[in-house]
C-alpha cells in the first residue's frame, strides 16, 4: 500500500549521512516505472535539504542531525510519479517525529533568588520558590524532569540544615527550629537541579533568605538605675534621659521603646517621652515639684516596644531617684487678691486692712512690704506689718479712679533671701457710700414764655447711692417762690418749676433748694430766661418788625 | 543524657482542663521546636501541637485547634500542654518529643490522660 | 485514615528479612527526603530508628536499613530476632502548618 508509519527520529544522531530512514514504495511499480519526491518544510521549503529522497528507490533520507529543541516534527508528502510525469498515486502523509536526547541541563531562571521568612518561625513555613527550566522533554522522558535539592547552607548556625526544598515545585521550606535573626540575619543556599528528575545533569544558583525580626527581644535599661537633681517648681524640665538597648531591627516598632511611669508619681507631677532617634525615654515635669512638700521622687519606669511582643518577655524596670532642689520662692499673698470693705471718706491715717504674704520656704525669711500701684494715691502701707492706712479721701464717686465701687491697688511682697524674690497682691477696697453728695437738678438753664407759660420738669440726680438718694425734697429761697413754685413728682425723682406770676422779658436767678432721703442738702441756682411769648418756647423771639 | 519527662496526666471529666508538663534536660531546650504527639488505646500516633523553639509561633492540629494551648519556658526548660474542653476522644498517651529537623527525637515517656464520666 | 498508608501487620521468621512500606503522596515522601521510621514496643515511648530516609541513629542496629522510591519509603529488617516484635511508624515532613504526617503502623510479628 502507499503509505508509511510515522517515523522516529533520534535527534543529535551521529550519521553518517545521509541516513537512511524508511523506503517509499507504490505497488504500481509493476507495471511502469516510478520515481519518487517529497515537499514539505524540511525538503523543498525551510527548513530545506533536511531530508531528501532517492528517485528512483524511494528511501527516505536524512541528510544531518535533527535538534527536538529546534523542531519536534516534521510534517512532509511522498509524491509517486511515472516516466511521462503524471501521478500515479496521491500525495502521502509523511510524520517524521524527533525523539528526545538528553542534551540540555536545566537552567535557573535566576542566578540569585531573594526570599524571605520571619524569625521564630515553625517547620513547615515556606519561604520561597526557585524556578529552573529545562528544553529536553519532560512529558515522554525523564530529560527535562527537574528535581531540586539544597546543596548547601551558609551559616550553619544552629543547624546544618535549616531549609529544605521541595524536589518538584521548588518551594523552600524551613525544616529546623531556629531561625533568629539576632544571630543569623541572613542565609546562602546553593541549591540545585537536576534533569532525568534528579539522576542527570546538575546546575547550581544560590537563594538568600532574609530573616525578618520579630519582636523577641524586649528592650533592656541600661543602667537600670539613676539619681536626677531638678529644681522645685520647674516645669517642663528635663529631669533625665533612661538608655535602653533592644536587639530587634532597629527604627523597627519591635525596636522603638515605650516608656511607661508604673510608680512613684502620685501627684502626676512627671510625664516621659520616646526620644524619636536615640529611642531614649526623655522623663520631664509636668509640673512644678514643690521642694518644701517632698524632696524626692522615686519613681519607677518600665519600658515596651510599639509592636507587642511575639513570646512571653520580662519587662525591664528602672528606677529613677528624684532629687528636688530648694529654690527661693517668692513670697504668695493670702489670698492673692484680697477684698476689703471701706467706708469713704474716712479720716488720714485712719487703718484700713492688714495684707499679708507667706514665703513657701522654710527658712524664716524677712518680708517687706509696699504700694506698687495706687492711682489716686490714697493708700499706704507699713513695710514690716503690712499694714494699710489712708493718706488720701477715699472717694467712692471718683469715676477716674473708683470703677464698680472698687479701688484697685497692687501691692509688693519682698522676701530677704538671696537673690531676694517678690510677690504681688491685689487689694481691691469696695467704698462704702457716705451721703457726701446732695442732689444736683439738670438742667440748670431753662427758657419760659411769660404768657400761659409751659412747666419745666427738671430731673434730679444724686451721686451717692441708695439710700443717699431719692425721695428728694424741693424748697425754693432767697424769694424766688413770689414768682416761681417747685414741686417734687410722686416718683420723688424730678423737680417742676412753674412761673406764677408774669415777669417782662429778662433772666432771672432761681434759688433752688433740694435735699436726698438723708436729708443732705444743695442749693442751686437755675437761670431762667423769660420770653416774651405764649405757651412753649426754646429761644426768645426777636423783636417784631413790622414792613 | 538527653531526656523529657512528661508529668500532669490523670482521670477527668468530659467538660474539664488538664495542664501537662514535660520537663527536659541534656540539650539546649530553646534551640528546637517541640510537639505534643497522642496515641489513643490501640491507635496510632497522632500529632496534636508544636511550638518553636523561641515559643513565638504554635500549630495546631484541627482536632485540638481552639481547646488545647501549647506554651513553654525556657528558663526552667519545660514544655506544657493546656487541655480545655476535654472530649472522650482526647483519651490518649500524651509524649512530647523535640523536633529535631525532620524527625522526633527524642520521645517522652508519656503521660496518660483518661477523659471518662 | 492516616495521611501516610502502611500495612496493618508484617511477619517473618527469625533470621528472615521483611520489609514495611509507607506510601505518601509527591507533597511528602516524594518531595523530601525527610522520611524517618519509629520502633515501638508495648507500653513505651516511640524510639527514632532511621531519619532522612536512611540514616540510623547512634546505637540502632544496622540490620534496620531505609529506603525510597517516588512515593513510597520502606524499611528492612535484615535477621529478624525477637525484640524486633513491635509496632513500626513511618513519618514524613511536609510543608505547612501540620509539618509531620505519620502512617498508621504495622504490627511486626516474629514468628
Known amino acids: 500500500d502507499w503509505v508509511v508509519a510515522p517515523i522516529s527520529v533520534p535527534e543529535n544522531g551521529k550519521g553518517p549521512f545521509p541516513q537512511r530512514l524508511n523506503q517509499l514504495k507504490s505497488n504500481k511499480d509493476r507495471d511502469t516505472k516510478i520515481f519518487y519526491s517529497i515537499t514539505g518544510p524540511g525538503a523543498d521549503s525551510p527548513p530545506e535539504g533536511v531530508f531528501a529522497v532517492e528517485k528512483e528507490t524511494g528511501w527516505l533520507l536524512l541528510n544531518k542531525p535533527l535538534d527536538r529543541e529546534e523542531i519536534a516534527k516534521y510534517e512532509l508528502f511522498g509524491h509517486a510519479v511515472s516516466e511521462n510525469g503524471a501521478s500515479v498515486e496521491d500525495p502521502m502523509n509523511i510524520s517524521i517525529i524527533v525523539t528526545d536526547q538528553n542534551d540540555h541541563k536545566p537552567k535557573f531562571t535566576q542566578d540569585t533568588f531573594r526570599g524571605s521568612v520571619l524569625e521564630g518561625v515553625l517547620p513547615g513555613t515556606s519561604v520561597m520558590q526557585v524556578t529552573a527550566t529545562d528544553e529536553d522533554d519532560a512529558i515522554y522522558t525523564y530529560n527535562g524532569v527537574v528535581a531540586y535539592s539544597i546543596h548547601s547552607q551558609e551559616p550553619k548556625d544552629p543547624h546544618d540544615l535549616m531549609f529544605t526544598i521541595h524536589r518538584s515545585t521548588g518551594t523552600i521550606s524551613v525544616i529546623s527550629s531556629g531561625l533568629d535573626r539576632e544571630k543569623v540575619p541572613e542565609y546562602t543556599l546553593t541549591i540545585q537541579a537536576t534533569d532525568m528528575d534528579g539522576d542527570g545533569s546538575t546546575t547550581t544558583a544560590v537563594a538568600v533568605v532574609e530573616i525578618l525580626d520579630a519582636n523577641d527581644n524586649a528592650p533592656m535599661f541600661d543602667p537600670q538605675k539613676y539619681e536626677a537633681h531638678v529644681p522645685e517648681n520647674a516645669v517642663g524640665h528635663e529631669v533625665q534621659r533612661l538608655t535602653v538597648t533592644d536587639l530587634d531591627a532597629p527604627n523597627s516598632p519591635a525596636w522603638r521603646a515605650t516608656y511607661l511611669i508604673m510608680g512613684g508619681d502620685d501627684g502626676d507631677h512627671f510625664t516621659i517621652t520616646t526620644h524619636p532617634e536615640s529611642n531614649q525615654g526623655i522623663l520631664t515635669t509636668r509640673k512644678g515639684l514643690d521642694f518644701e512638700a517632698k524632696n524626692q521622687h522615686t519613681l519607677y519606669v518600665e519600658v515596651t516596644n510599639e509592636a507587642p511582643f511575639v513570646l512571653k518577655l520580662p519587662t525591664s524596670t528602672a528606677t529613677i531617684v528624684v532629687h528636688v532642689e530648694d529654690v527661693n520662692e517668692a513670697p504668695v499673698f493670702v489670698p492673692p487678691s484680697k477684698v476689703v470693705e471701706v467706708q469713704e471718706g474716712i479720716p488720714t491715717g485712719e487703718p484700713v486692712c492688714v495684707y499679708t504674704a507667706e514665703d513657701p520656704d522654710k527658712e524664716n525669711q524677712k518680708i517687706s512690704y509696699r504700694i506698687l500701684r495706687d492711682p489716686a494715691g490714697w493708700l499706704a502701707m507699713d513695710p514690716d506689718s503690712g499694714q494699710v492706712t489712708a493718706v488720701g479721701t477715699l472717694d467712692r464717686e471718683d469715676e477716674q479712679f473708683v470703677r464698680n465701687n472698687i479701688y484697685e491697688v497692687m501691692v509688693l511682697a519682698m522676701d530677704n533671701g538671696s537673690p531676694p524674690t517678690t510677690g504681688t497682691g491685689t487689694l481691691l477696697l469696695t467704698l462704702i457710700d457716705v451721703n457726701d453728695h446732695g442732689p444736683v437738678p439738670e438742667p440748670r438753664q431753662i427758657t419760659i414764655c411769660n404768657q400761659s407759660p409751659v412747666r419745666q420738669v427738671l430731673n434730679i440726680t444724686d451721686k451717692d447711692l441708695s439710700p443717699h438718694t431719692s425721695p428728694f425734697q424741693a424748697q425754693l429761697t432767697d424769694d424766688s417762690d413770689i414768682y416761681w413754685t417747685a414741686e417734687v413728682n410722686e416718683e420723688g425723682d424730678t423737680v417742676v418749676l412753674s412761673l406764677k406770676k408774669f415777669l417782662k422779658q429778662d433772666t432771672y436767678d432761681v434759688h433752688l433748694s433740694l435735699s436726698d432721703h438723708g436729708n443732705k442738702e444743695q442749693l442751686t441756682v437755675i437761670r431762667a430766661t423769660v420770653c416774651d411769648c405764649h405757651g412753649h418756647v426754646e429761644t426768645c423771639p426777636g423783636p417784631w418788625k413790622g414792613g | 543524657e538527653v531526656q523529657l519527662l512528661e508529668s500532669g496526666g490523670g482521670l477527668v471529666q468530659p467538660g474539664g482542663s488538664l495542664r501537662l508538663s514535660c520537663a527536659a534536660s541534656g540539650f539546649t531546650f530553646s534551640s528546637y521546636a517541640m510537639s505534643w504527639v497522642r496515641q489513643a488505646p490501640g491507635k496510632g500516633l497522632e500529632w496534636v501541637s508544636a511550638?518553636?523553639?523561641?515559643?513565638?509561633?504554635?500549630y495546631y492540629a484541627d482536632s485540638v485547634k481552639g481547646r488545647f494551648t501549647i506554651s513553654r519556658d525556657n528558663s526552667k526548660n519545660t514544655l506544657y500542654l493546656q487541655m480545655n474542653s476535654l472530649r472522650a476522644e482526647d483519651t490518649a498517651v500524651y509524649y512530647c518529643?523535640?523536633?529535631?529537623?525532620?524527625?522526633?527525637?527524642?520521645w517522652g515517656q508519656g503521660t496518660m490522660v483518661t477523659v471518662s464520666s | 485514615q492516616s495521611a501516610l498508608t502502611q500495612p496493618a501487620s508484617v511477619s517473618g521468621s527469625p533470621g528472615q528479612s521483611i520489609t514495611i512500606s509507607c506510601t505518601g503522596t509527591s507533597n511528602d515522601v516524594g518531595a523530601y527526603n525527610y522520611v524517618s521510621w519509629y520502633q515501638q514496643h508495648p507500653g513505651k515511648a516511640p524510639k527514632l530508628i532511621l531519619s532522612?530516609?536512611?540514616k540510623r541513629p547512634s546505637g540502632v542496629s544496622n540490620r534496620f536499613s531505609g529506603s525510597k522510591s517516588g512515593n513510597t519509603a520502606s524499611l528492612s529488617i535484615s535477621g529478624l530476632q525477637a525484640e524486633d516484635e513491635a509496632d513500626y511508624y513511618c513519618s514524613s515532613f511536609t510543608s505547612g502548618k501540620t509539618f509531620v504526617l505519620f502512617g498508621g503502623g504495622t504490627k511486626l510479628t516474629v514468628l
Open positions: 511550638i518553636s523553639g523561641s515559643g513565638g509561633s504554635t
Open positions: 518529643a523535640s523536633w529535631g529537623g525532620g524527625w522526633f527525637d527524642p
Open positions: 532522612e530516609v536512611n
